[in-house]
Interface confidence: low
């Protein structure tokens, strides 16, 4: 059964997917697709990475974490009701039938007038995009109105801040996580 994630119309939706590279930068190709994971590949691909970089993405879909450390969580910007459905995160591990497949269900609700909020297990919020500068001290974040010409590797969100702040050198497991190697 799919893990369910929720967002409201107009928010950014967050669909977590992780793997732990055998070594930093030793990446495994990943694809994200709309629809349940088929036997091979992803159907209706919205984003893809290869061994080095993000090599394909479509409007409104981006990786908000450090995919070079295995964080291939998908962010969908400014969601509409039409974005509801199953999404497939496929970790394309070399070898026959070795792929790890994760089906994540996104439920979009109509925007409502700010009631007292309740934190969900799969809390999905419209965090503002953040430009993150990492140093030895606490990460500094600057909220941006827009991100014209910013490299994908620079893009982060508060969600990524939260994960990175726990352990600088360890990846968290999540609803969709595997270790490689």
């Amino acid at each position: 059964s799919e893990v369910e994630y929720r967002a409201e119309v107009g928010q950014n939706a967050y669909l977590p997917c992780f793997y732990t590279p055998a070594a930093p930068g030793n990446l495994v190709p990943v694809c994200w697709g709309k629809g349940a994971c088929p036997v091979f590949e992803c159907g209706n691909v919205v984003l893809r990475t290869d061994e080095r970089d993000v090599n394909y993405w479509t409007s409104r879909y981006w990786l908000n974490g450090d995919f070079r450390k295995g964080d291939v969580s998908l962010t969908i910007e400014n969601v509409t009701l039409a974005d509801s459905g199953i999404y497939c995160c496929r970790i394309q591990i070399p070898g026959i039938m070795n792929d790890e497949k994760f089906n994540l269900k996104l439920v979009i609700k109509p925007a409502k007038v700010t009631p007292a909020p309740t934190r969900q297990r799969d809390f999905t919020a419209a965090f503002p995009r953040m430009l993150t500068t990492r140093g030895h001290g606490p990460a500094e974040t600057q909220t941006l109105g827009s991100l014209p010409d910013i490299n994908l590797t620079q893009i982060s969100t508060l969600a990524n801040e939260l994960r990175d702040s726990r352990l600088a050198n360890d990846l968290r497991d999540s609803g969709a996580t595997i270790r490689i190697g």
Epitope: T118, R119, Q120, A125, A159, E161, S165, D173
Partner: antibody, heavy 121, light 107 residues
């Protein structure tokens, strides 16, 4: 250095109220979840409530719902637990702990020293 | 609510022993399980998060694993400072729930 310090515990009569504070230092509570976990004398751990101050999300255990209120003041980097209509079974050491906004990563990596709440006539 | 059934409730062991504590979730909790150590009069300390990840500063003799809804904490070679009570916790759904604890005592 990350630190959580609870205060406000004490002896209170059944039906009475107490307000516990959890003062955080070394991190911004607005980026995390703050939990209250209690431990009755000689018993195990029981989650009570949590808040993600940055978003204002709150959750409660059924046993305290409608009696306890969790809140936070990000300007003071402090979380609170307002406990009303206290019962004998609320007697416990109350700990605040730091967790994470996303439930899947929400184990508690820093804990306060605890504050004892005794409900007795 | 998800029940976390922890066993044994107590055990006696000697320094150098290999110790295994198990926790069974009443339903799927994915990898959202943590293990804590608590000594008398002290707050719990995080040992393992996300079922198998060793928390920073925790000795490598501690390890965690998952098999379906069964979770295991292993201490490969028990040290004097390891005598304490250990709790598992699931944080997959609200409310987060703890196991009842396992007290590790000196034989």
């Amino acid at each position: 250095e990350v630190q959580l310090v609870e205060s406000g515990g004490g002896l209170v009569q059944p039906g009475g109220s107490l307000r516990l504070s959890c003062a955080a230092s070394g991190f911004n509570i607005g980026n995390y979840a703050i939990h209250w976990v209690r431990q009755a004398p000689g018993k195990g751990l029981e989650w009570v409530a949590d808040i993600t101050p940055g978003q204002g999300y709150t959750e409660y255990a059924d046993s305290v719902k409608d009696r306890f209120t969790i809140s936070a003041d990000t300007s003071k980097n402090t979380a609170y637990l307002q406990m009303n209509s206290l019962r004998a079974e609320d007697t416990a050491v109350y700990y605040c702990a730091r967790g994470y906004v996303y439930r899947m990563w929400d184990s508690y990596d820093y804990w306060g020293q605890g504050t004892l709440v005794t409900v007795s006539s | 609510d998800i029940q976390m059934t922890q066993s044994p409730s107590s055990l006696s062991a000697s320094v150098g022993d290999r110790v295994t504590i198990t926790c069974r979730a009443s339903q799927d909790v994915n990898t959202a399980v943590a293990w804590y150590q608590q000594k008398p009069g002290k707050a719990p300390k995080l040992l393992i998060y996300s079922a198998s990840f060793l928390y920073s500063g925790v000795p490598s003799r501690f390890s965690g694993s998952r098999s379906g809804t069964d979770f295991t904490l292993t201490i490969s070679s028990l040290q004097p400072e390891d005598f304490a009570t250990y709790y598992c916790q699931q944080h997959y759904t609200t409310p987060p729930t703890f196991g009842q604890g396992t007290k590790v005592e000196i034989k």
